[in-house]
Interface confidence: low
């Protein structure tokens, strides 16, 4: 009877310089003696070494040298006894591509290499970028706590540094940039704003980073209405707070452009002495059309804004003057093109 | 008088395209944004999206990205979907529309039918 | 997306009547919900704006109320020529949704 000597391993595996694998592995050898128990020991080979000899990648025998550049790096995981001969391998370089082999020994009978399944490593350039984690969405003055990891990159070899940047951490300690956990307090002004985590492995070359773009949630800020006059000069008139009175002669062209600061984008509308107008124009882009005027189309006009975060409003009487001349009088003004619907 | 008028009915193949026009007049061309909507037979109405015709900036549903394609030609103010692919379920009245004036008045198309058979 | 349910697929009424055409908004839509009228062969019309504002020319038996997620379109004394189907939409956020319709029969 032919003993029989078998190995499930894969054929190839790809790793990213800097991570981990762990490859599954089980063997069979034959074991008949019920009168002795000798040490099992199963060694990882690089191809074309000599078992005799050479140095191995990773063994269970204490007495075997291992290469000390896998030292620590190329361990076996699970139970020999139970013919598990799985490889882990960490903080994997590029000089580690290239095919191993397995090789068991116990007492004098059992001694096998098993050439024909040999295991393909090749370790290819670090694409593998760090995973931001947040709980979204971010709010404005309400600290929130972010971490960085790298998928793929295990306990085996070096610890991995981390560094932090973007806008939002100026007035951060250079220290607490440097965890792999941040608290950060988010402003309006950094909605938009890239944050990066850069992570490093100690002693190695090698650098990945990932940067996210920051969804700031914050409350309506800088509420105006802008009034542009349809008479081709884009004359401006910009309100700021309640009660201004704004003449304006009957016959007249206006829009009314109402502008808020918020994330997400507020609800805008607009009433006319407490009624809403335009549904589907104003609720998207706060703009409002008044054309032609007439003498009783004047009054209080309010844009309402609406948001998650809190809700403003801001009023201003239209006096509609009848027509008399063909000038405008506007006290406050400034140049601007005149805006069209959107 | 405010009009928008829309190109007549089609019937094609499945796996063609089909493009749709929409000419309006009786008011400023550029100043309202396009809507478009598309109503399958006996169906309720679904929106597919709308284009700025001042700038050509389109806002799409979801669902219609990759399917329909709203452009403009301002010098002819005609707004156009354009749409690819066609299965049998993209059978249907498809209507443009725009919101007018002080109080957002809808103009709507007379719809055109669009038939996917082979 | 937000989901306008018409529960109601189709009702029916007699001339001089008054009937209740309703419509819930899947999530808070305030008052930004219009209804439309469609008669058959024809494109939608315009009714109610703002939850119950109604546009100029729109005859006064029709009436829209509601905010937040439950609207009602009601038309008191029913006419002949109100048989059509009719339409919630809500214009809140993107995508501006519908609902499925409720069909209008006069007896």
């Known amino acids: 009877e032919k003993p029989v000597y078998e190995l499930q391993v894969q054929k190839s595996v790809t790793v990213q310089e800097g991570l981990c694998v762990l490859v599954p592995c089980s063997f069979s050898y034959p074991w008949r003696s019920w009168y002795s128990s000798p040490p099992l020991y199963v060694y990882w080979f690089r191809d074309g070494e000599i078992p005799y000899y050479a140095e191995v990648v990773a063994t269970n025998n204490p007495d075997r040298r291992v290469k000390p550049e896998t030292q620590g790096r190329f361990r076996l995981l699970g139970d020999v006894q139970k013919k598990n001969c799985s490889l882990s391998i960490g903080d994997a370089r590029m000089e580690d591509t290239g095919s191993y082999f397995f090789r068991v020994e116990r007492g004098r009978d059992v001694k096998y290499s098993y050439q024909q399944n040999k295991l393909n490593l090749e370790v290819t350039a670090l694409i593998e970028k760090p995973d931001i984690h947040f709980l979204e969405p971010l709010e404005s003055g309400r600290p929130t706590r972010l971490s960085c990891s790298l998928p793929g990159s295990c306990e085996a070899g070096p610890p991995l540094t981390f560094s932090w940047t973007g806008n939002a951490l100026s007035p951060l300690d250079p220290e607490t940039t440097r965890s792999s956990e941040l608290t950060l307090t988010p402003r309006p002004e950094d909605h938009g704003t890239n944050l990066t985590c850069q992570v490093k492995r100690q002693g190695a070359q090698v650098t990945t980073e990932r940067t996210v773009q920051l969804n700031v949630s914050y409350a309506p800020q800088n509420l105006a209405i802008s009034i542009f006059f349809r008479n081709g000069t884009g004359t401006a008139l910009r309100i700021l707070s309640n009660g201004m009175s704004v003449p304006i002669q009957e016959g007249q062209s206006l829009f009314l452009a109402c502008t808020v600061d918020s994330n997400p984008p507020a609800s805008l509308s607009w009433f006319r002495e407490g009624k809403a107008l335009n549904p589907s124009q104003t609720s998207m882009s706060g703009t409002l059309e008044l054309p032609n005027i007439g003498a009783r189309e004047g009054g209080e006009f309010t844009c309402r804004v609406q948001h998650p975060l809190g809700s403003q409003h801001l009023s201003f009487i239209l006096s509609v003057q009848r027509s008399s001349s063909s000038c405008i009088c506007v006290t406050e003004k400034q140049q601007g093109s005149w805006p069209l619907l959107t | 008088e405010i009009q928008l008028q829309q190109s007549g009915p089609e019937l094609v193949k499945p796996g063609a395209s089909v493009k749709v026009s929409c000419k309006a007049s009786?008011?400023?061309?550029?100043?309202?944004?396009m809507y478009w909507v598309k109503q399958s037979h006996g169906k309720s109405l679904e929106w597919i999206g709308y284009i700025d015709p001042y700038n050509g900036g389109t806002t799409y549903n979801q669902k219609f990205k990759g399917k329909a394609t709203l452009t403009v030609d301002k010098s002819s103010s005609t707004a156009f979907m354009h749409l690819n692919s066609l299965t049998s379920e993209d059978s249907a009245v498809f209507y443009c529309?725009?919101?007018?004036?002080?109080?957002?008045?809808?103009?709507w198309g007379q719809g055109t039918l669009v038939t996917v058979s082979a | 997306d937000i989901v306008m349910i018409q529960s109601q697929k189709f009702m029916s009424t007699s001339v001089g009547d008054r009937v209740s055409v309703t419509c819930k908004a899947s999530q808070n839509v305030d008052t930004n919900v219009a209804w439309y009228q469609q008669k058959p062969g024809q494109s939608p019309k315009a009714l109610i704006y703002?939850?119950?504002y109604r546009y100029s020319g729109v005859p006064d038996r029709f009436t829209g109320s509601g905010s937040g997620t439950d609207f009602t379109l009601t038309i008191s004394n029913v006419q002949s020529e109100d048989l059509a189907e009719y339409f919630c939409q809500q214009y809140n956020s993107f995508p501006l949704t519908f609902g499925s319709g409720t069909k209008l029969e006069i007896k």
């Open positions: 529309a725009f919101y007018y004036g002080y109080y957002g008045v809808p103009y």
């Open positions: 009786g008011y400023s061309f550029t100043d309202y944004n």
């Open positions: 703002s939850a119950s």
